[in-house]
Amino acid sequence: LNDLNVSPPELTVHVGDSALMGCVFQSTEDKCIFKIDWTLSPGEHAKDEYVLYYYSNLSVPIGRFQNRVHLMGDILCNDGSLLLQDVQEADQGTYICEIRLKGESQVFKKAVVLHVLPEEPKELMVHVGGLIQMGCVFQSTEVKHVTKVEWIFSGRRAKEEIVFRYYHKLRMSVEYSQSWGHFQNRVNLVGDIFRNDGSIMLQGVRESDGGNYTCSIHLGNLVFKKTIVLHVSPEEPRTLVTPAALRPLVLGGNQL
């Protein structure tokens, strides 16, 4: 049951982000997962590293992966998917999952290639009146239904405010998204929900929009969170450069 000879799925994540690496196998039998092993093969002559193993309802992260890896799949339903949090540069490489069924010699193997990019800026700058895109993407090899995307704002006034909410009720197939409060009609979802992308665009930025924006993407009982700090600077004076004097001329409100 070797999936290693087909080209493995690839994930590209930024340092500090999370990655969900799928390891699901289809079985005609009613047997449950007995043991799971996750190994990292960094390549370039580096030694393989053990990431996590599971047996007898005991999930054990190893070494530097402690507190950063969890089995996220439904083990009873042939899913040994691994969630890697707070991704580091050293985490780059090929992750190999091995699943064993009780009383079977066959081993189901699956690989995922993880590429790690430098950390994305956690702080963004925008001028009053401008527009800004705030990214929030959860990288996963598995197509999982996003059930909710939520953006929460906390500014200097300490009170938390809902910026944007998206729901997807699977049973009723109802999609519902809305921007709230003083963000009403100024926020749009620009990410592709079906690719676990909950990025938003904020337009008509006000000075009071400066603060922390926390995005949470819900995939069933799995929640991915990311916080962005937005700094708002006063409106940029629009300048006109005259070829003769090369001197800036500040335009008034009704001048063109």
């Epitope: 092993d37 005991l58 999930s59 190893i62 070494g63 402690q66």
Partner: antibody, heavy 115, light 104 residues
Framework: DVQLVESGAELVRPGASVKLSCKAL????????MHWVKQTPVHGLEWIGI????????VYNQKFKGKATLTADKSSSTAYMELSSLTSEDSTVYYC???????????????WGAG | VLTQSPASLAASVGETVTITCRAS??????LAWYQQKQGKSPQLLIY???SLEDGVPSRFSGSGSGTQYSLKINSMQPEDTATYFC?????????FGAGTKLEL
């Protein structure tokens, strides 16, 4: 040198409890499973259970559930086994042993305490 | 259940010794052999049925598959006098063979 240093012999009354300790030296305590094994002339070596100090997870041999309780203190790199409701049947040698992971679902006891 | 045989045996220096271990079901090479000298704790000799642990003399070897496994000592030495145990790590509860007492 990697070592497991166990507490000494104990003299206890029937019905009482006792807590045995096992201090890990010269390795990262949270990286390895710690197991406890009982040895008697009649039953030979019997596996009691495992604690993984990193995750705090435990698995017990059904036979010792209710008899043994395994705990671990990360700060002192020490594993403990508490035995309750003691009888003469419990009077024997107990080993703590470190289980090393060899990959691909293979694990073996590579370091043992003196008992 | 692991059935180990023989329960005891005596061998001369230079002789080849074989100890066997039979599992009640397939344990897929998840077997180890330990040596325990009088008054000491067990020591790992062989893991994964046939891999020699670091520092163990090459006269020790392991073989087998499925339910049948064996430990071979190629040329018995006086320091090999001990009790030998097999152990299966395929599933919990982990179990040990009853042991084989090897005497000179």
């Amino acid at each position: 040198d990697v070592q497991l240093v166990e507490s000494g012999a104990e003299l206890v009354r029937p019905g009482a409890s006792v807590k045995l300790s096992c201090k890990a030296l010269a390795y990262t305590f949270t990286d390895y499973e710690m197991h406890w094994v009982k040895q008697t002339p009649v039953h030979g070596l019997e596996w009691i259970g495992i604690i993984h100090p990193g995750s705090g997870g435990t698995v017990y041999n059904q036979k010792f559930k209710g008899k043994a309780t395994l705990t671990a203190d990360k700060s002192s790199s020490t594993a403990y086994m508490e035995l309750s409701s003691l009888t003469s049947e419990d009077s024997t040698v107990y080993y703590c042993t470190r289980r090393r992971y060899y990959g691909s679902s293979y694990w073996y006891f590579d370091v043992w305490g003196a008992g | 259940v692991l059935t180990q045989s023989p329960a005891s045996l005596a061998a001369s220096v230079g002789e080849t010794v074989t100890i066997t271990c039979r599992a009640s079901e397939n344990i897929y090479y998840s077997l180890a052999w330990y040596q325990q000298k009088q008054g000491k704790s067990p020591q790992l000799l062989i893991y994964n049925a046939n891999s020699l642990e670091d520092g163990v003399p090459s006269r020790f070897s392991g073989s087998g598959s499925g339910t049948q496994y064996s430990l071979k000592i190629n040329s018995m030495q006086p320091e090999d006098t001990a009790t030998y145990f097999c152990e299966q790590t395929y599933d919990v509860p982990l179990t040990f063979g009853a042991g084989t007492k090897l005497e000179l």
